[in-house]
Structure formats: structure tokens, C-alpha cells
């Protein structure tokens, strides 16, 4: 009877992560009695898969009846493969013997690669906001895809960017992969509704890409422009001066009215207009009781927008047509019924 | 069914022969080893010798140069020719198939007497 | 040889009672350990092939263990059909040798 050769008819299988993979193995005689064991890689520091004399492989299962005398298929199936289970795999025959079994004959090896998708693109902006004309820089990160071929794009608003740079590591050999890509985008004062996109395409995906977003709402900050009006005579004596905040985003906004560089009243944006880029206007006002004053007025609308310096507009009053009323020493009229925004 | 069924036993007087037989039925008989097993009446169970797939033979010191095992593959049959028989060979005579992977014995036959007295 | 030396020679139990032979090999068999069971009249029964496998279609309250030198056959609960004479075998090397018999014996 010609000597036993052990046959691994496949060089590779490749498998997607979670799947079963099937390595196959037949040996061409039942001589010598002896077991059947399964590892990956080769050599002293060679990773052993299956026993069939004894162990425990909840992993692996038998394709055939390995218990049987006659049975010369020695073909197992590894369940729920992951990218740390790729590598050639080598069935190896033992003969019995004492005080161990002997290793025999070994199969030639197949080569297992684990297709395993990316994981969803994380995209990541800028820590703090910034205003329009600056460059920003957006991260986009995907991790544990096999093989290392993959392909990432970015996009604003459906318009491919191309001023990124893409790195995939490790750059050598690996179980799986990351791929980490950092984008620079020019904010403009439209960029309130728009989006940043990093879309991964790999040979997993089936055409079907995967995309992270970040919106840039997150990252701009567009600083408000300030009016500041003098309406016509309410009253005799009271003069209605208006502040127009526009144009501003985010919401974020407090306004402080000064006469003559004297606080007269704060208030906090509240009930604000949307324009239809994204960003608001607001108008705050003043009655400002003219005949209270002996010289002209310096009225100064000062406003502290998302946490940054303050920027104010001011305007002068002229009081001296009104003589003054005696007993009147409030400059301005903070009554509730005053206190309100004009839009 | 996996079967074994032995066959030829009997008296014979010491320093006669007797050649004993083993069907084989519902297996590939020529996939295993094949082993013969004796029990003394009251003892325990004594190993006596094996056929591999390829024909090689081994043999327990007390009957080697006496007993002679084979096989006929085509027949599905195994035997046990025993020479020069001795009043210690006196037992029931069990063949075996080496069913399992290691040649672990799985299936027995049910015996036959083999009886040496004169 | 190897020799095959099993303990108790006899063994008195009841039913429903958790009992353990053991066997102790002369030399390393590496794991080649087969455990038997016979009753009066009848042709062996296999019951475990290396060392703990157990042979199909038998109970799995029979369970085999151990290494090296020395084996043990457990039997979780006793049941009449239980009590009989337990061999056990190495096949590591010819010639095979068995143990002399453990005989189980209802109480």
C-alpha cells in the first residue's frame, strides 16, 4: 500500500467575518492508526485548532465522522470567523505512539483571509467654532476592515472635496485594518444647513458605501451685524430706538443697551427669526425719555454673541430741543409693556 | 446491521489445531483492524492478536509461532489458525473490529469455545 | 508488557449510587485507554475509547478520565443493568493488555 499523503485541496479560502469557513483535508490511506490535528501556521510556535484524540474546540466542528476507523476526510468547519482567525491553516496526521503520538504527515496548507467590513465612519470637526472664511479640519475614521483595499471620499453638500489626506494602517500585513483621513473645509456664511460627509467604499460593502456625517452647524459660528435706528416720536418726550441683530448663528446672544455708557437694561435672545440659511435675526429696542436728559444721548447696543468679545453699534441722540421735566430722573422706561422685541 | 459472527470452535485435543472464522456483515471489512480476544471460563480478557488494513500482523507472546491470523477481504472474513494448541488456550475466542480512529475496539462478536482437553 | 492494574477487584453498590474504578497503567499509554463492560455469558461492551470518549450510543452517565498512568470510569447513578464486570484496555502498543476486572455487585 502506497504511503499516506495528506491532501488540502484548497491554497486559500476566503471568508466574511461572521461566516463559517470550511478547510478541507483528505488523507489518501487509513494507515497509520493515528490522529488528525488541525493548525495555524507552521513551526515551533505553531497554534493548535483542533485535536481529534482530545480537547475541547466549541469553534469547530467535523465535516465527517472522525470517530470512524475508515474515515479519511479530516475536513473541519470553523464557525463565526473573525479577521484574528486569518492565516494558513495546516492538517497535520500523527501516528500512534509513546510516550507521544508522532507527527507523521502534513497537508500542504490553506490560506485563510477573512473579508470583514469597516466599521460606520465616525467624522469628527474642529473643538471650537469657527467663522466664516476660515479652513477647518474634519476626521474621519473607520476601523477592522480586511482585506486593506478600501476607498474614502468626502463630500460638502453633495460636492466631492479634494484638499484631504487618507492614511491606512498598519501599513504591513495585519489581521485588519483602520483607515483615518483628515479633510480642510472653507466655512462660509451659507454653511449653517450644510453637511460634511466621508463615505468608505470596500469590497464588502457590495456597492453599497458607508457614510459618516457631521453638520456644520456644529462648527460655524456666524457673527451677527448690528443696526441701530431711531424711530420716529412715540410720544412728546419719548424717543424708540432699535437695535437689529442679523444674520447670526447660533442662537446664543445677549444684548446689553447703554446710555451714554451706562447699562440700562440686558436681555438674552429668546424668541428669535430664522432666516432660510440657518441663521437668525433678532431686534431689541429702547423707549428712551428724552426730556430725563439735559445733553445729548449716546445710546450704545452692545452685543455678546456665543461667549466671544462683544461687538456694539451706537447712536447719538440729540435732547437739546427738550427741555428737561422736572422730577423725572429715569433715562429710560423698563415697564413690562416696554420690555418686549419688535419683529 | 454491524455484525460479527464467529465460528469453528470446538474440542481438539492438546497439540492439535483448529482455525477459527469471523464474518463480517454492514461495514467496509477492509477499512479496519481486526483483532481476536479470548476469555478463559471465570477469567478475564486476554488480547490475542490483530490483522492491519495492509495485512501487517502482531501477535501476544504466549501464541506467537502457533497461531496464525488473516483476512479475505473479499469474503469479509477473518481468521484465527491455531497450531500446536495447549490446555491454557482453552477459552471462549471473541473477534473484534478495531472500529475506531485510534483502533479502539467497537464491535464484538458474540464468541466461540475453543476447548482443549484430552 | 504493559501491565493494567485495576481497583477494587469487587465492588458492592445500590441503585441510584455514584461508583468510580480506576486503572493504573505500568507505563505512559498515552490516552489509549478503553473501558469495557461485560455481563455473565455475553460478549464485551465498549464503553469508552481514549481515556473519555464515550462510544456511540452509550449513556452518558459512563464517563471516563485521567492521564498518563492513571484512568477512572465513573458511573453517576447506578441502575440494575448496570451491575456487571468493567475491563479496562490500553492500545497504546502491542500487545494490548487488558486489567484483570472490576466486578460491580448489587448491595
Known amino acids: 500500500e502506497e504511503e499516506l499523503q495528506v491532501i488540502q485541496p484548497d491554497k486559500s479560502v476566503l471568508v466574511a467575518a461572521g461566516e463559517t469557513a470550511t478547510l478541507r483535508c483528505t488523507a489518501t490511506s487509513l494507515i497509520p492508526v493515528g490522529p488528525i490535528q488541525w493548525f495555524r501556521g507552521a513551526g515551533p510556535g505553531r497554534e493548535l485548532i483542533y485535536n481529534q484524540k482530545e480537547g475541547h474546540f466549541p469553534r469547530v466542528t467535523t465535516v465527517s465522522d472522525l470517530t470512524k476507523r475508515n474515515n479519511m476526510d479530516f475536513s473541519i468547519r470553523i464557525g463565526n470567523i473573525t479577521p484574528a482567525d486569518a492565516g494558513t491553516y495546516y492538517c497535520v496526521k500523527f501516528r500512534k505512539g509513546s510516550p507521544d503520538d508522532v507527527e507523521f504527515k502534513s497537508g500542504a496548507g490553506t490560506e485563510l483571509s477573512v473579508r470583514a467590513k469597516p466599521s460606520a465612519p465616525v467624522v469628527s470637526g474642529p473643538a471650537a467654532r469657527a467663522t466664516p472664511q476660515h479652513t477647518v479640519s474634519f476626521t474621519c475614521e473607520s476601523h477592522g476592515f480586511s482585506p486593506r483595499d478600501i476607498t474614502l471620499k468626502w463630500f460638502k453638500n453633495g460636492n466631492e472635496l479634494s484638499d484631504f489626506q487618507t492614511n491606512v494602517d498598519p501599513v504591513g500585513e495585519s489581521v485588519s485594518y483602520s483607515i483615518h483621513s483628515t479633510a480642510k473645509v472653507v466655512l462660509t456664511r451659507e454653511d449653517v444647513h450644510s453637511q460634511v460627509i466621508c463615505e468608505v467604499a470596500h469590497v464588502t460593502l457590495q456597492g453599497d458605501p458607508l457614510r459618516g456625517t457631521a453638520n456644520l452647524s456644529e462648527t460655524i459660528r456666524v457673527p451677527p451685524t448690528l443696526e441701530v435706528t431711531q424711530q420716529p416720536v412715540r410720544a412728546e418726550n419719548q424717543v424708540n430706538v432699535t437695535c437689529q441683530v442679523r444674520k447670526f448663528y447660533p442662537q446664543r446672544l445677549q444684548l446689553t443697551w447703554l446710555e451714554n455708557g451706562n447699562v440700562s437694561r440686558t436681555e438674552t435672545a429668546s424668541t428669535v427669526t430664522e432666516n432660510k440659511d440657518g441663521t437668525y435675526n433678532w431686534m431689541s429696542w429702547l423707549l428712551v425719555n428724552v426730556s430725563a436728559h439735559r445733553d445729548d444721548v449716546k445710546l450704545t447696543c452692545q452685543v455678546e454673541h456665543d461667549g466671544q468679545p462683544a461687538v456694539s453699534k451706537s447712536h447719538d441722540l440729540k435732547v437739546s430741543a427738550h427741555p428737561k421735566e422736572q422730577g423725572s430722573n429715569t433715562a429710560a422706561e423698563n415697564t413690562g409693556s416696554n420690555e418686549r422685541n419688535i419683529y | 446491521e454491524v455484525q460479527l459472527v464467529e465460528s469453528g470452535g470446538g474440542l481438539v485435543q492438546p497439540g492439535g489445531s483448529l482455525r477459527l472464522s469471523c464474518a463480517a456483515s454492514g461495514f467496509t471489512f477492509s477499512s479496519y483492524d481486526m483483532h481476536w480476544v479470548r476469555q478463559a471460563t471465570g477469567k478475564g480478557l486476554e488480547w490475542v492478536s490483530v490483522?492491519?488494513?495492509?495485512?501487517?500482523?502482531y501477535y501476544t507472546g504466549s501464541v506467537k509461532g502457533r497461531f496464525t491470523i488473516s483476512r479475505k477481504n473479499a469474503k469479509n472474513s477473518l481468521y484465527l489458525q491455531m497450531n500446536s494448541l495447549r490446555a491454557g488456550d482453552t477459552a471462549i475466542y471473541y473477534c473484534?473490529?478495531?472500529?475506531?480512529?485510534?483502533?479502539?475496539?467497537?464491535?464484538w462478536g458474540q464468541g466461540t469455545m475453543v476447548t482443549v482437553s484430552s | 508488557d504493559i501491565q493494567m492494574t485495576q481497583s477494587p477487584s469487587s465492588l458492592s453498590a445500590s441503585v441510584g449510587d455514584r461508583v468510580t474504578i480506576t486503572c493504573r497503567a505500568s507505563q505512559g499509554i498515552n490516552n489509549y485507554l478503553a473501558w469495557f463492560q461485560q455481563k455473565p455469558g455475553k460478549a464485551p461492551k465498549s464503553l469508552i475509547y481514549?481515556?473519555?470518549s464515550l462510544q456511540s450510543g452509550v449513556p452518558s452517565k459512563f464517563g471516563g478520565s485521567g492521564s498518563g498512568t492513571d484512568f477512572t470510569l465513573t458511573i453517576s447513578s447506578l441502575q440494575p443493568e448496570d451491575f456487571a464486570t468493567y475491563y479496562c484496555?490500553?492500545?497504546?502498543?502491542?500487545?494490548?493488555?487488558f486489567g484483570q476486572g472490576t466486578k460491580l455487585e448489587i448491595k
Open positions: 473484534s473490529r478495531g472500529g475506531n480512529w485510534d483502533d479502539a475496539f467497537d464491535i
Open positions: 490483522i492491519g488494513i495492509a495485512g501487517d500482523t
Open positions: 484496555q490500553q492500545y497504546n502498543s502491542y500487545p494490548y493488555t
Open positions: 481514549t481515556a473519555s
